[in-house]
């Protein structure tokens, strides 16, 4: 729901976006998940900090854990275990890479309303969870698996070969958990928690990453991470699964890695419990373009996992990488041996389909020349998936419901034509047996979140709708956005367009292209932000556009795998050709036209910049690869091949921004990077600085000291000041 | 290649003791169950004992249950056999080994070339 | 335990005859079957599992069927080098039992 627009005699209560409303989150929106518990009760931490527990069909709710316990511990997060007999409380949060981080853990015994005294966790641990049944306790600590009968009792260490930087178990090591398995944990419990698979990873022969971090002190740290960049040594993998009941009786048994996998570097990819003795494992080739799942039995009589060929299925592609950004994970029906998963179609566009004894017989669930997005649930009588098949917006996300007991089977959209205008981009939650779900509303109008029946799809109630929000905008003046798309060559370049709030077509605007450009991913999108571009549009009077170019998702293979061996060409090209459209619109002043982006975006723009078009005065690049030399292997080599000789070394060396110093010379550019970027590592930046140097080329460049490839905290204010100030002298506009 | 060798066989009295090592190569040795095999003189072959891939977990023939140990170290990627007490039924080429559960209910498929056990006075 | 009976003990053929070895089990053990090909003084190979599935790098002439507890080994054009001792060995429970084994010799 977006404001709806002033006429003109309210337009001076009108205000303007300022750039201080987007540096205080004046106008950030909230959703709301439920953390559910069953089929018809979630948990939810209210806004005065209590967790309560909500009863969908009695109506009732309570408080199962006070904000006064919560305090007591200073806790942050919270998890009840399933017998509901314990909740753990988690302090003392501090982050380590994107999604890892270590926390003090208390148990909270809910039957005396005391905290479980003798045997307490050791701190700080590295992951903590549950079993899915009970309140087994499984978790890390220095690198090492330990587990717990029950709270109280004394641990039991399952790994003993844990060291910081060199063997990781039950926790990726950074390029796991950054760009295979995006999580802070490798550890699964089986359904009814009597295995635990783990992970583990040795990183002893990675070459390690080494930078300062500054500090308060008179001497800098060396931060040294195992990191794998494009050619380089990589983890070794290996997964074992105990038995929790009996966990000193045999001991962690070793997972055989499939033969056509084994027989050269590998990786794991994701582990899918199907029953307590049933799992499934996927591998995936070095050179990404062949992945194996491995459907794995226990064999009582020989406490072993046996994975028997019948039981693997390849994946392969033969005109890019396996998968989309991952290779997609499957979602096991009630037989347990049948399965769905998400993989291309015949036509090249990714879709739903159904696997019963081999991928070659697999039957397509879904198809059209759109993609399925996701698997949320498959019950006995449905599957719930998303896509973007609705009016053929690549950028929008329906939940569809498919029925599976019935044939042929029927599809149904749950939220095509819920709130139409205001809602085009979903998620959803569901409950245990989809008994009942949330959908969660990302815009493009204000985000919301409703309840709902899973039988018959009738909205419940709403869960948050964002009102205050909506009351704060009612005096904002909003740019106006447009989703279209430009025709050229025979792709289909689609874009976002925020526009200025009173826009005149007969007026002429500066440009700013925004772009990220990363393959596999999606810029433009239906969903509600505001932002620093938006106030870009609402108070500077730019326009701003987001193009989707070669390389990005959600609309074929063709698109995808364009960018396949030879990244920074086509991903470039398309932002030019866009460019040239714009101007063609006549409403872009030519002579004001600049791009800017973070990350691979930085990369993008940088190649733009140094494209020798004309067509930019000025960018930005912020946090850039400047070679996939640098760029950790996982990513990198997926989408490039390897930097060798005999297969693609040529194009590494060709596409880095340091051999386009030259082309600065007639831009203005800023370059920007944090020094503790872990990510991206800020060699990337020195490397172009270095070569802007060496060929006397000027430019601008701000570093961010002790800062990662995020730049968070006040550096974030600072970063959007400093950029405010350079596009506004670049565009001529007065402060 | 992946090859299994044995060592260790040779002449002992009766109620002697004798320990068969199985050097393995070209696999992931760790990730596999192994068993010994023995074949006497002239006749076909009879399984002995059995150890999982973490080699937590034994198991032995009735004929030689409390005589004979199995085990193994993933470190050293090898399996041994400790033979006590020794009978002159005993006498056979003993083989080691890998079971691999890729094969649907799982199957022998990797065989050392077999080690001589003699017991006799 | 899991006996297993085979039959005949021993059989005398001559080269591109089709030779066909059968083994019972005493109880039923699904399509959990493998045969083994044995020649003096070599290990024993593994040429079929699963009652039905060729181990790749076999020749093609070695055919395996059945389930339950009757399975047959059947070599459709015996080669000279297939002169050997055969022995079927049941996988579906522990502990893993043989065959006493065929011995096929030249006629």
């Known amino acids: 729901l977006r404001p709806s627009r002033v006429h003109n005699s309210e337009e001076n209560t009108m205000r303007a976006l300022t750039l201080k409303d987007i540096l205080n989150g004046t106008f950030s929106y909230k959703t709301f998940f439920p953390n559910w518990i069953s089929g018809q009760e979630y948990l939810h931490q209210s806004a005065d900090n209590n967790i309560v527990l909500y009863n969908i069909e009695t109506g009732q709710s309570y408080t199962i854990l006070s904000n006064r316990t919560m305090k007591s511990v200073n806790a942050s997060n919270y998890g009840l275990s399933p017998d509901r007999q314990f909740v753990y409380l988690e302090s003392d949060y501090s982050k380590l890479w994107r999604y890892s981080y270590t926390a003090t853990y208390y148990i909270y015994d809910l039957s005396n309303g005391e905290f479980v005294r003798g045997n307490e966790l050791p701190r700080p641990i590295q992951y903590l969870c549950w079993s899915p049944v009970g309140s087994k306790l499984a978790y890390v600590y220095q690198n090492n698996i330990y587990l717990k009968q029950r709270p109280g009792d004394p641990p039991f260490q399952i790994t003993f070969n844990g060291r910081e930087n060199k063997i990781f178990n039950g926790i990726p090591d950074w390029v796991y958990e950054e760009e295979m398995l995006a999580t802070k944990y490798a550890l699964w419990w089986s359904p009814n928690g009597k295995f635990l698979a783990y992970a583990e990873f040795n990183d002893t022969d990675i070459p390690v990453i080494a930078y300062s971090y500054y500090g308060d002190e008179q001497y800098p740290r060396t931060i040294n991470i195992p990191y794998p960049k494009a050619g380089a040594k990589n983890p070794v993998v290996r997964i074992f699964i105990i038995d929790t009941t009996y966990p000193a009786y045999v001991g962690p048994q070793e997972v055989p890695v499939p033969a056509m996998i084994a027989s050269s570097d590998y990786y794991f990819s994701w582990l899918t419990w199907v029953t307590d003795e049933r799992v499934c494992l996927q591998w995936l080739k070095r050179v990404q373009n062949v992945s194996v799942l491995s459907i794995c039995d226990f064999r009582e009589d020989w406490q072993t996992w046996d994975c028997p060929k019948t039981q693997e299925h390849i994946e392969e592609s033969r005109t890019g990488w396996a998968g989309g950004f991952f290779v997609s994970t499957p979602v096991f029906s009630y037989d347990a041996i049948s399965y769905y998963k998400i993989f291309s179609d015949k036509d090249g566009y990714k879709h739903i389909h159904y696997i019963k004894d081999t991928v070659e017989n697999a039957i397509q669930i879904t198809s059209g020349k759109w993609e399925a997005i996701n698997i949320f649930r498959v019950t006995q009588d449905s599957l719930f998936y998303s896509s973007n098949e609705f009016e053929e917006y690549p950028g929008r996300r329906n939940i569809y419901r498919i029925s599976i007991g019935s044939y042929p089977p029927s599809k149904k959209c749950v939220t095509c034509h819920l709130r139409k205008e205001r809602c085009q981009y979903y998620t959803a939650s569901f409950s245990d047996y989809a008994k009942y779900y949330a959908l969660v509303c990302y815009g493009p109008g204000i985000p919301i979140s409703t309840l709902h029946d899973g039988r018959t799809d009738q909205e419940i109630k709403i869960l948050e709708e964002n009102k205050e929000l909506e009351n704060a905008l009612k005096n904002i003046q909003l740019p106006k956005e447009e989703i279209k798309k430009l025709e050229v060559d025979e792709i289909t370049l689609w874009y976002k367009m925020i526009l200025p709030p009173q826009f005149d077509r007969s007026k002429k605007y500066p440009l700013l292209i925004q772009v990220y450009g990363g393959p596999c991913s999606q810029s433009v999108r239906s969903v509600f932000a505001v932002n620093w571009i938006s106030y870009l549009a609402s108070k500077e009077g730019m326009v701003i556009a987001l193009v989707d170019g070669r390389g990005t998702a959600f609309q074929g293979d063709k698109l995808l795998y364009a960018v396949y061996r030879k990244l920074g060409v086509y991903e470039v090209e398309d932002q030019i050709t866009a460019v040239r459209k714009f101007i063609e619109m006549g409403f872009i002043d030519e002579k004001r036209i600049a791009i800017w982006g973070w990350s691979y975006g930085g990369y993008v723009s940088s190649l733009a910049l140094a494209s020798g078009t004309g067509l930019f005065k000025c960018g930005i690049a912020v946090a850039p690869v400047s070679s996939w030399e640098y760029y950790a292997s996982v990513y990198t080599e997926r989408f490039m091949g390897l930097p060798t000789k005999d297969d693609n070394l040529e194009h590494y060396k060709n596409s880095t921004v340091m051999a386009r110093a030259e082309y600065f010379r007639n831009v203005d550019y800023l370059l920007i990077h944090g020094t503790a970027d872990d990510n991206v590592h800020f060699q990337n930046s020195a490397q172009i600085a270095k070569a802007l140097v060496n060929a006397q080329v000027d430019f601008q460049a701000m570093w961010y000291s002790d800062q990662n490839h995020g730049l968070s905290g006040l550096s974030t204010n600072h970063l959007y000041t400093h950029m405010t100030h350079f596009l506004k002298q670049c565009f001529s506009l007065s402060d | 290649e992946v090859q299994l060798v044995e060592s260790g066989g040779g002449l002992v009295q009766p109620g002697g003791s004798l320990r068969l090592s199985c050097a393995a190569s070209?696999?992931?040795?760790?990730?596999?169950?192994m068993i010994w095999v023995r074949q006497a003189p002239g006749k076909g072959l009879e399984w002995v004992s059995a150890i999982s891939g973490s080699g937590g977990y034994t198991f032995n023939a009735d004929s030689v249950k409390g005589r004979f140990t199995m085990s193994r170290d993933n470190s050293k990627n090898t399996l041994y056999l400790q033979m006590n007490s020794l009978r002159a039924e005993d006498t056979a080429v003993y083989y080691c080994?890998?079971?691999?559960?890729?094969?649907?209910?799982?199957?022998?498929?990797?065989w050392g070339q077999g080690t001589l056990v003699t017991v006799s006075s | 335990d899991i006996q297993m009976t085979q039959s005949p003990s021993s059989l005398s053929a001559s080269v591109g005859d089709r030779v066909t070895i059968t083994c019972r089990a005493s109880?039923?053990?699904?399509?959990?079957l493998n045969w083994y090909q044995q020649k003096p003084g070599k290990a024993p190979k593994l040429l079929i599992y699963a009652a039905s599935s060729l181990q790749s790098g076999v020749p093609s002439r070695f055919s395996g069927s059945g389930s339950g507890t009757d399975f047959t080994l059947t070599i459709s054009s015996l080669q000279p080098e297939d002169f050997a001792t055969y022995y079927c060995q049941q996988s579906y429970s522990t502990p893993p039992t043989f065959g006493q084994g065929t011995k096929v010799e030249i006629k």
């Open positions: 070209g696999f992931t040795f760790s990730s596999y169950a």
């Open positions: 080994a890998k079971r691999d559960g890729g094969y649907e209910g799982g199957a022998f498929d990797i």
């Open positions: 109880q039923s053990i699904s399509s959990y």
